[in-house]
Each structure stands twice: as structure tokens, then as C-alpha cells.
Amino acid sequence: KFSKQSWGLENEALIVRCPRQGKSSYIVDWYYSQTNKSIPTQERNRVFASGQLLKFLPAEVADSGIYTCIVRSPTFNRTGYANVTIYKKQPDCNVPDYLMYSTVSGSEKNSKIYCPTIDLYNWTAPLEWFKNCQALQGSRYKAHKSFLVIDNVMTDDAGDYTCKFIHNENGANYSVTATRSFTVKDEQGFSLFPVIRAPAHNETKEVEIGENTNLTCSACFGKGAQFLATVQWQLNGNKITDFSEPRIQQEEGQNQSFSNGLACVNTVLRIADVKEEDLLLRYDCLALNLHGLRRHTIRLSRK
């Protein structure tokens, strides 16, 4: 539990966190276990300690070994061990098993591949992604923050995915790569282009001036759990939050699952004390998922 394996490639940055976590105010001392030699904290060193982190900028094969971190609170000292292995760069495309991070599984409705260990680094978007060493291109691949999203995942999307990013330390840039396998699960669920159940397109609803009224936007997106499925209202093409009228409020979407297994979401628009000017507005029910956007419009009329 308090000994952690870390690995990297020579000439790349490697940052390792002390497996023994403590409060951020605690002092952390790092040592090279074999020699009990203290790791310096000065950033001019290629290998230096920075609180909970041990930084190899860049790493060399000779850095391999066990590093001890001692986390010191005012009254307690607690020890952790980082087992670091630095490998030579592979001449060919194959990524050996010992360089692979944990395998992740995905399906059509959940195809996120997180870039391993990236939270330890000072990086800026976008990430570069490769599959079996080929740069990923095409609209199906979306690099978002620290993960990759694949649209319409198919079984042949399985494979080894490598993320590549730049770590910046005091103005100097260092490359980092990390690889993990992605497997595709064949699930019973599926997602469809959104189907709006209510309101009907170009519907008109009769309302009483001065009364309260509710408009329900209800849409279905397929079967089973959905990766992305949102239902919301717009007023004259604007988000409700951008429309500064406190009488008109949108409830958070409520998930519904019908007996036929359809995954649907309902979002209610509440209008208090209906006024004449509300009859002039265009109310758009929007349903959005990875397949696209569908819009139904409803207007209000006086009863």
C-alpha cells in the first residue's frame, strides 16, 4: 500500500508522488534508499524533490531504484516507498507490457480514455493521442481535457492508446508519454439520435394570464445508461440562465426509464404569474447527445 511502482522512459519527464499521503503543510523528505542519500530540493538538479513529488527532469535509466519518502507532521513521521524503473526508448512501435498502465473498458455510450498520471504534471491542452503508434485523426476522436472521447465506438477501436503531452518546469519543456489498453464491451444498451416525446414540434399551449404554467421537455436517447444526454429549454434561442427573468425557472432534468428500457430525460420549465410578454417568446425544447441535437418549438397563447 505504501510502496508504489512508477515507471517512465529515458529522456522523458517522470514525476512520482509519495505513496504516503499527508496534509499539504507537512514536510516531505526524499532519500535514495540504496545509499540513504538525501534528494536535493533545488530545482537546478535534474532529479529533485518538491514536497510530495519527486521529479526526474528528464529521467535516465540509472535513476531506477527505490526512493524513500518520509512525511513529517509536528508529531508523526510516516514512510512511503517509490519503486522507480526507467526504461530505454523502444526502437519499434510495440509498447511492452511493463510500460502499460491499467486497461480501461468502453462501450458506445462511455468511451472515455483518461491519460494516466497526467494530474501530476504541469501541462497545457491539447493532448496528443495515438493508437498503436498512429496519430488519431478524424472527427470521431475528441481530445477533451485529460481524456480522449471516441464517438460511436466499435470493436476495432480496441487497442493501445498513448497520450503525449509536454510538462513545463520553470520555462523548460519535457515530453511525457503514457500508454494504456482500451477494450470495447458489447453491451445491450445503445444510443440513438434524440427523440423528443413532448412537446410536439410547433405546438401551441393555451395559458391564463396571471396563472402559473409548466412546460415539459421530454426526450429519449436509446436504451441503458447514456454517456451524454441532456434536455434543456431555451427562450428565443438563449439559455434560461442567460434570460434574466426570475419568474421563469428550469428544473434539473429527471431521468426516466420506461418498461421498454428506453432512457429518457424530462426537464420542466416553470413559469410563474404568466404575463402578456411571455406569449411573445419562442420556447425551444432541446435534446442533445453524441449523435446530435433535436429541437422542438412551442409557443404560448391566451386561453
Epitope: K1, Q21, T75, F76, R78
Partner: antibody
Amino acid sequence: EVQLLESGGGLVQPGGSLRLSCAASGFTFSVYDMIWVRQAPGKGLEWVSTIRGEGGGTYYADSVKGRFTISRDNSKNTLYLQMNSLRAEDTAVYYCARDPWSTEGSFFVLDYWGQGTLVTVSS
Amino acid sequence: EIVLTQSPATLSLSPGERATLSCRASQSVDDDLAWYQQKPGQAPRLLIYDASNRATGIPARFSGSGSGTDFTLTISSLEPEDFAVYYCQQYNDAITFGQGTKVEIK
């Protein structure tokens, strides 16, 4: 000097309620996770509940879940234990204690304890 | 929950003798184990944390060892003030205590 002082114990009927307090001093209260531990007469120690520092996340032993509520007022340096639906088996000395280390999701030892307050549940 | 079993329930020894107390966990707790001493009418006092580290101010005659599921508290030479009840506590998964070992004067 770190001090923890429990109060609020006493005799209560089964099904009744009681609120224990623990006044802390001598350390930055809001930073530390705080714990209630109890000890039935002549028996061993039993962890009851933990509350995180600023985050305020709470954890309970199965034996008290749904009946007891741990809370804290960092502005008053005070820890509380609201005990509802009390049973005879809740009779014990209740100690408040400090966890000097924990980070979110982990637990550690208890380095300072109060002197305890006796709760007796009896008709 | 993780169950801690302490043995023996009672240990009868004379001052100056060596005391060996055992604590066994129902599943591995790594080194997330502590030992406490409790005297009648007092709150427990922390002796050992992380299985083998002495807490501040604890005399060197107290030592802890073990990891995983089997742990030992050793008092190398009992002093009169060491006669008390000793509890082990795990903090690997929430918190549980052993039922205690009473060290009494023979």
C-alpha cells in the same frame, strides 16, 4: 496544550435523545478530523463516528448508522454527537478524540482523547 | 468490517519480565495498526503507530512489529506503571479495535 472536554452525558430512557459536546482547545480545530469512540462498562473500545476537518465528510459504525449524527462548529471549536433512538446497548463512556493526520478517504490513530462522558440508557 | 483478535485475554507477569501481546487481523491491514494503553478510569494513550513507530514520549521498552495480519506489541521489561489494558486498532478500512489484553501483576 491540546485539551478535549466532553459534556452532555447523563441518564436517558430507551428511545430518547441526547446531544454530546466536545470542546477543543490548544490546536487549530478546523484542520483535524475528529472522532467519537465509546466504551461500554467493563468492555473494550468501539469506534462510533468520524468527521473530516474543513470538508466535513462523515463516517459511522454500522451499530449507530441512521440514529447518531456527528457534526462540528469550527467557529466554536466544538464537536457534537446527536444521539437519537437510544438503546440500552448504547450505554457507555463516550470519548472524543483527534485524528492528527488523516487525508480524505483515510483514517489514522487517535493521539489526544478527552476524559469521557457517561451515557446511561435505562428505563 | 475488519475484526481484530487479541491474545491472550490476560497476561500475568512480574515487574522486569518481558510481555508479548498479539493482535491478529481478519484481513490484511498493511502496516495500518496502532497500540494503546488504558488504565482504569483514564482515556487510552497512544503507544505505537504504523505497526512499529513509537509515538512521542513513549519509552523505548515499548516496541511494535508485524505487517499484514499478524502484529506484536513487546514490552521488554515491565515497569510497575505498565500494568494496564492494551488495545490494538486498525485504520486501513475505517477504524476497529481489538477486544484488549489485560497485563496484570502476577
